[in-house]
């Protein structure tokens, strides 16, 4: 047979679907690997072929499209399960070919079990919403294409295991769920269950979104350096250990890259001959504000080290800040006691 462009196993698309629910899976070739769509390929005389490898097996086998009630079917570039079964888990391959051309890609499909409270091994999308912002809407995800627009499905929303009825600031509106002036207590998993009829049968789609309430853009600030500060003097004798924490608060900013670094006499620690250790730790508030601490330590400080200029720097998308540590040798004049 002719050579086939094999894109391998596309692990970027680890598709998870719930057991006993409909699933429609598009062949990734047309979305991510080829420059043309299915219609163009089909009109050019190319055929789309599906096959699969069961979980924990090596043998590729054709998909059985002759199951009762057309449980598995193909429509254009979509593989349909109506509904899925647990043992449908495996690696699925779609191959586009004719006598002179061939291209294929495989992808993993995992059929996941859920309990009555929608707990499962499913990875849920995370929707971040700003605290105290006026109105946030989330939409029941990944339900397009399951039923025609003429069908009006019933939609029930849950927070965790509890149906959302008379929640004071959360309002179900069909496929949408609206949050009014959200608070941290609105954090959690929100599940929509969409029920629709097809050929005399009722199908259910279960979709869960994790809501995380985060700091508002109106509260976003440049970094704030808590330590070092002008009130604390690091007074040491040669031979002692010098430990200076650089503690910086970053308000939550969507997609911000928060940075903290030290300079010694204007140079990065890697560029100086001093034997310096830097350890970093990060903690988060309930609204994902970040406190980042970089501890600079010199095991046995020398008189020269005590004359150097130690500066903590911080940067986010709102701006930069810097603060020098007050370091001096013990006995060199009167100063306030060191407090850490």
């Amino acid at each position: 047979s002719e050579r086939c462009d094999d894109w391998g196993l596309d692990t970027m698309r680890q598709i998870q679907v719930f057991e006993d629910e409909p699933a429609r899976i598009k062949c990734p070739l047309f979305e991510h690997f080829l420059k043309y769509n299915y219609s163009t390929a089909h009109s050019s005389g190319l055929t789309l072929i599906w096959y699969w490898t069961r979980q924990d097996r090596d043998l590729e086998e054709p998909i059985n499209f002759r199951l009762p009630e057309n449980r598995i079917s193909k429509e254009k570039d979509v593989l349909w399960f109506r509904p899925t079964l647990l043992n449908d888990t495996g690696n699925y391959t779609c191959m586009l070919r004719n006598t002179t051309y061939c291209s294929k890609v495989a992808f993993p499909l995992e059929v996941v079990q859920k309990d009555s409270c929608f707990n499962s091994a499913m990875r849920f999308p995370v929707h971040k919403m700003y605290i105290e912002h006026g109105i946030h809407k989330i939409t029941c995800p990944n339900v397009d294409g399951y039923f025609p627009s003429s069908v009006k499905p019933s939609v029930t929303w849950y927070k965790g295991c509890t149906e959302i009825v008379d929640f004071h600031n959360v309002l179900p509106e069909g496929m949408n769920l609206s949050f009014f002036i959200p608070l941290v207590s609105n954090n959690g998993n929100y599940t929509c269950v969409v029920t629709y009829p097809e050929n005399g049968r009722l199908f259910h789609l279960t979709r869960t979104v994790t809501v995380k309430v985060v700091g508002s853009p109106k509260d976003a600030l440049p970094p704030q350096i808590y330590s070092p500060n002008d009130r604390v003097v690091y007074e040491k004798e040669p031979g002692e250990e010098l430990v200076i924490p650089c503690k910086v608060y970053f308000s939550f900013i969507m997609d911000s890259h928060n940075e903290v670094w030290w300079t010694i006499d204007g140079k990065k620690p890697d560029d100086v001959t001093v034997d310096i250790t830097i350890n970093e730790s990060v903690s988060y508030s309930s609204t994902e504000d970040e406190t980042r601490t970089q501890i600079l330590s010199i095991k046995k400080v020398t008189p020269e080290d005590l004359r150097r200029n130690y500066v903590c720097h911080a940067r986010n998308t709102k701006g930069e800040a810097e603060q020098a540590a007050k370091v001096k040798q013990k006995g060199n004049g009167c100063t306030e006691p060191m407090t850490l």
């Epitope: 605290i131 105290e132 912002h133 006026g134 109105i135 004071h168 600031n169 009014f180 002036i181 608070l183 941290v184 207590s185 109106k218």
Partner: antibody, heavy 118, light 107 residues
Framework: EVQLLESGGGLVQPGGSLRLSCAAS????????MSWVRQAPGKGLEWVSA????????LYADSVKGRFTISRDNSKNTLYLQMNSLRAEDTAVYYC???????????WGQGTLVTVSS | EIVMTQSPATLSVSPGERATLSCRAS??????LAWYQQKPGQAPRLLIY???TRATGIPARFSGSGSGTEFTLTISSLQSEDFAVYYC?????????FGQGTKVEIK
């Protein structure tokens, strides 16, 4: 200095309407959620309504839902409460309060008395 | 909605004595609890937020403790100006709700 000054209270008949105003100063009004809280004579405090800092999100106590409307004009640093279909049980001192998700109501106005009586 | 219950309804204390006020939530409010003081004819004043943090300008004799569903406001040594009604309030969930109040009166 943060100041909140309510006005618009008075005597009104059952079924009538009243519009309360709260003039804010001493802080960036447009950056805060604002609320109305009321206190019936000799009784405790009851949150009535809240509005988001930009004015697009509103919430109401069940006791006033459908009758009261909260709004704000950030250009005038003013909070409003439109009260319709007033009942005797709406008689109270109405306070406007700055609302913070991390500290509750940190500043209050002096209040304005609304009396609903025939 | 979350129901806040304060006890006792009235507390009779002599000046200089300690006063302990309790507040219970019908479900967890984490540490999202505030205490207010209200004197006759005046608006409430924020004393404590985050269950235990004193608001600006509040004397150190006022302290708050607790988390979840059980909270306490302690006034370590009552001054004449402390005789008032005290309210707890949760701001964890909408609607924000108040306790019915505790009146601290002179014994």
């Amino acid at each position: 200095e943060v100041q909140l000054l309510e006005s618009g209270g008075g005597l009104v008949q059952p079924g009538g309407s009243l519009r309360l105003s709260c003039a804010a100063s001493g802080f960036t009004f447009s950056a805060y959620t604002m609320s109305w809280v009321r206190q019936a004579p000799g009784k405790g405090l009851e949150w009535v309504s809240a509005i988001s800092y930009e004015g697009d999100g509103t919430l109401y106590a069940d006791s006033v839902k459908g009758r009261f409307t909260i709004s704000r004009d950030n250009s005038k640093n003013t909070l409003y409460l439109q009260m319709n279909s007033l009942r005797a049980e709406d008689t109270a001192v109405y306070y406007c309060a700055r609302s913070l998700y991390w500290s509750g109501f940190d500043y209050w106005g002096q209040g304005t008395l609304v009396t609903v009586s025939s | 909605e979350i129901v806040m219950t304060q006890s006792p309804a009235t507390l009779s204390v002599s000046p200089g004595e300690r006063a302990t006020l309790s507040c219970r939530a019908s479900q967890s409010v984490s540490s999202n609890l505030a205490w207010y003081q209200q004197k006759p004819g005046q608006a409430p004043r924020l004393l404590i937020y985050g269950a235990s943090t004193r608001a600006t300008g509040i004397p150190a004799r006022f302290s708050g403790s607790g988390s979840g569903t059980e909270f306490t406001l302690t006034i370590s040594s009552l001054q004449s100006e402390d005789f008032a009604v005290y309210y707890c309030q949760q701001y964890n969930n909408w609607p924000w709700t108040f306790g019915q109040g505790t009146k601290v009166e002179i014994k």
